[in-house]
Interface confidence: low
């Protein structure tokens, strides 16, 4: 676009420029080619020699312009059409400019302490004659000249007549600029163009409100000599929480969010989250929902899983092993990263479940205690004669660091009972006779421990090879027994089980089994043999 610094046609009042001498340039009212009233300056001292008539405009502020265009519209009379002017008439005039920091005033033209700079000598492409004048055919010439680069705040133009018959119809002074614009969400200020022969003017843009450029690399454009923007480089992006709408960034409405400038548009909140405010950069999870630190903001909010289902166990008593298995939680919380952790509590044999304490390092968990992906686990090194509560907690990425203590667990309570906590080699053959066998074993509960005095033992025995259904039974309250009335030189199978008196007796299993052969009649007794 053109930024007009002076347009003589726009003035309805007198221009009031300074003319010297006073019988030179004269301000006259007239009409333009469209019959609109204008103010013009004319001079036609063609019959007198040595003309030196000056016309100085008022002070013209250059604004941002450095290279200024001067457009002159004028008419010039053909000297040959003026009788008697052949020796003195001229068909050119001169144009000058003088840079100043301020208006020189309306007094004598002070075209500087040094000579004003000449812009050019202007000649008419077309001049008019006396005949044209009679037919009112005014042949209008237009000439454009460029001045600059300018360095001071403004300047005066000066026109020198040296004997022509000339009328200045219009003086227009302007510079070209690339107009203020928004491109790629960056505002570029109005920028004065350089001359057609110089390089493009590179201009850094400013990101519009709520937008941002690449750090250290603002968007740029180039202002061409003709006042057109060229070669955009880079752009801005709407900041988090804002999206592009034409030339500006608008806030994401409630229910939408934008996490970073790299995304062009706001996105609807992921499942189970919400954004109540404008310009949300993330959506807040609804109550009881959350994201893990590794979840992106675009991920749906999830929640901790419900408890594992259908927790089942099996307890083998020799060795004492507790096997657990379970099904996944009914509600995974919307996540696939469900793991399981076990908490083992050892409780008193009687009394409320609350009288428990952690099992301690003795108990081993297979494959591990925490972070299980499997839905089965085995607990080893449990104590006989104890009651255990085992919690299986379902966890996922939003369970939090201590969620296993929360409510998302299933639990079983298992009494190991005295059971038969012996290996085969822990039952000793103390004495073998032709008709009797003496056996002893370790007490399953240490002497003095609760329940130790109540333990009873049941010994079942039968001849090897006979049916297990044909057996004899003997009970004892001590961890030793002597079985009599046996057949000599006969192999017997002995089985032991331990239990406290009461209904749990039948639940215990007979194991292990050991075999002992009675001696022949001739043989003498053997004592304190090694363990079987």
């Amino acid at each position: 676009e053109e930024v007009i610094l002076l347009d003589s046609k726009a003035s309805q009042a007198e221009l009031g420029w300074t003319a010297l001498p006073s019988n030179g340039w004269e301000e006259i009212s007239g009409v333009d080619e469209h019959d609109r009233p204008i103010r013009t300056y004319q001079v036609c001292n063609v019959l007198e020699p040595n003309q030196d008539n000056w016309l100085q405009t008022g002070w013209i502020s250059r604004g941002r312009g450095q290279r200024i265009f001067v457009e002159l519209q004028f008419t010039l009379r053909d000297c040959s059409s003026i009788p008697g002017a052949a020796g003195t008439c001229k068909e050119t005039f001169n144009v000058y400019y003088l840079e100043t920091e301020a208006d020189l005033g309306r007094g004598r033209p002070r075209l500087g302490g040094s000579r004003p700079r000449k812009i050019d000598t202007i000649a008419a492409d077309e001049s008019f004659t006396q005949g044209d004048l009679g037919e009112r055919k005014m042949k209008l010439n237009t000439e454009v000249r460029e001045i600059g680069p300018l360095s001071r705040r403004g300047f005066h133009l000066a026109f020198q007549d040296v004997g022509a018959c000339v009328a200045l119809v219009s003086v227009r002074v302007y510079y070209k600029q690339c107009r203020a614009t928004v491109r790629g969400l960056a505002t570029f200020p109005a920028t004065a163009a350089e001359s057609a022969f110089s390089t493009l003017v590179e201009v850094a843009g400013t990101c519009v409100a709520h937008s941002e450029g690449e750090p250290g690399s603002p968007p740029r454009m180039h202002c061409g000599a003709d006042g057109e923007w060229l070669v955009p480089v880079g752009r801005c992006s709407c900041s988090a929480g804002f999206q592009e709408r034409g030339d500006f960034c608008e806030a994401c409405p409630p229910g939408f969010y934008k996490v970073s400038p790299r995304r062009p548009l706001c996105s609807p909140c992921p499942e189970h989250s919400r954004a109540l405010e404008n310009a949300s950069t993330f959506c807040v999870c609804q109550d009881s929902y959350a994201r893990s630190p590794t979840d992106p903001p675009s991920a749906s909010c999830t929640r901790p899983p419900s408890a594992p289902r259908d927790l089942q166990y099996s307890l083998s008593r020799s060795p004492l092993v507790l096997r657990l298995r379970w099904l996944p939680p009914a509600d995974s919380g919307g996540r696939s990263d469900v793991t399981y952790s076990l908490l083992c509590l050892r409780c008193g044999r009687e009394g409320p479940a609350g009288a428990c304490e952690p099992c301690g390092p003795r108990v081993a968990f297979l494959p591990r205690q925490a972070g299980l992906r499997e839905r089965a686990a085995t607990l080893l090194h449990l104590r006989p004669g104890a009651r255990y509560t085992v919690r299986v907690a379902a966890l996922n990425g939003v369970s939090g660091p201590a969620a296993a203590a929360g409510t998302t667990y299933a639990q079983v309570t298992v009494s190991t009972g005295p059971g038969a906590p012996w290996e085969e080699d822990e039952i000793r053959r103390d004495r073998v006779e032709p008709q009797s066998v003496s056996l002893s074993w370790r007490e399953p509960i240490p002497a003095g421990a609760p329940g130790a005095n109540d333990t009873e033992y049941e010994i079942r025995y039968y001849e090897k090879g006979q049916s297990e259904q044909t057996y004899s039974m003997v009970k004892t309250g001590a961890p030793t027994v002597t079985v009599t009335n046996l057949k000599p030189a006969t192999r017997y199978v002995f089985q032991i089980r331990a239990a406290s008196p009461g209904p749990s007796w039948e639940a215990q299993s007979f194991n292990p089994s050991i075999e002992v052969q009675t001696l022949g009649e001739a043989a003498s007794g053997s004592r304190d043999q090694s363990p079987a």
């Epitope: 893990s292 952690p358 205690q369 925490a370 972070g371 990425g397 201590a402 296993a404 929360g406």
Partner: antibody, heavy 117, light 107 residues
Framework: EVQLVQSGGGVVQPGGSLRLSCAAS????????MHWVRQAPGKGLEWVAV????????YYADSVKGRFTISRDNSKNTLYLQMNSLRAEDTAVYYC??????????WGKGTLVTVSS | EIVLTQSPATLSVSPGERAILSCRAS??????LAWYQQKPGQPPRLVIY???SRATGIPARFSGSGSGTDFTLTISSLEPEDFAAYYC?????????FGGGTKLEIK
């Protein structure tokens, strides 16, 4: 014996960095979440950070978020706390602690961090 | 974050007497609360977890109660070795927090 042995404390200027270590022994380290807790001189306990057993999840107290980083090397049975941009108010005894499902059942003896110019 | 407020800040009790320590949460932590004992120059020691479960090796004179927002640690008959600072701690959220502590001193 189950124990946590701490190292890495010392005196550091404000804005400086320090890395604390906590070596675990006597238990299966990679079965447990681990925490850092601190205690300013004459003050109460303040929880600092936690890391899950496999290092996949980390949580921090607001007061250290963005400055401290908790990490672990299960192959070395070691827990770490990288402390950057230290401030005077970070001066404290720092304890590592095992998350015994559910509470902190094993603690290190602590290491003193002094932030002073 | 969940704020835990312990009271009193200092409790003076004679050996053999009962001590009652209080911990109040700014919002419900269900039963996700632990109590720790700390003696000068030593790290804390777990006393109670799950609000009422005694940790391994803790004598029966220590008991915990409460759920939701109000919790109590009771020491039924104080022994000389029980005089120390006690802290409650919640683990019901990812931002774990401790109470300010109660110093239990000999009267």
């Amino acid at each position: 014996e189950v124990q946590l042995v701490q190292s890495g404390g010392g005196v550091v200027q404000p804005g400086g960095s320090l890395r604390l270590s906590c070596a675990a022994s006597g238990f299966t380290f990679d079965d447990y979440a681990m925490h850092w807790v601190r205690q300013a001189p004459g003050k109460g306990l303040e929880w600092v950070a936690v890391i899950s057993y496999d290092g996949s999840n980390k949580y921090y107290a607001d007061s250290v978020k963005g400055r401290f980083t908790i990490s672990r090397d299960n192959s070395k049975n070691t827990l770490y706390l990288q402390m950057n941009s230290l401030r005077a108010e970070d001066t404290a005894v720092y304890y590592c602690a095992r998350d015994g499902l559910p509470a902190f059942d094993i603690w290190g003896k602590g290491t003193l961090v002094t932030v002073s110019s | 974050e969940i704020v835990l407020t312990q009271s009193p800040a200092t409790l003076s009790v004679s050996p053999g007497e009962r001590a009652i320590l209080s911990c109040r949460a700014s919002q419900s932590v269900r039963s996700n609360l632990a109590w720790y004992q700390q003696k000068p120059g030593q790290p804390p020691r777990l006393v109670i977890y799950d609000a009422s479960s005694r940790a391994t090796g803790i004598p029966a004179r220590f008991s915990g109660s409460g759920s939701g927002t109000d919790f109590t640690l009771t020491i039924s008959s104080l022994e000389p070795e029980d005089f120390a600072a006690y802290y409650c701690q919640q683990y019901g959220s990812s931002q774990l927090t401790f109470g300010g502590g109660t110093k239990l001193e000999i009267k």
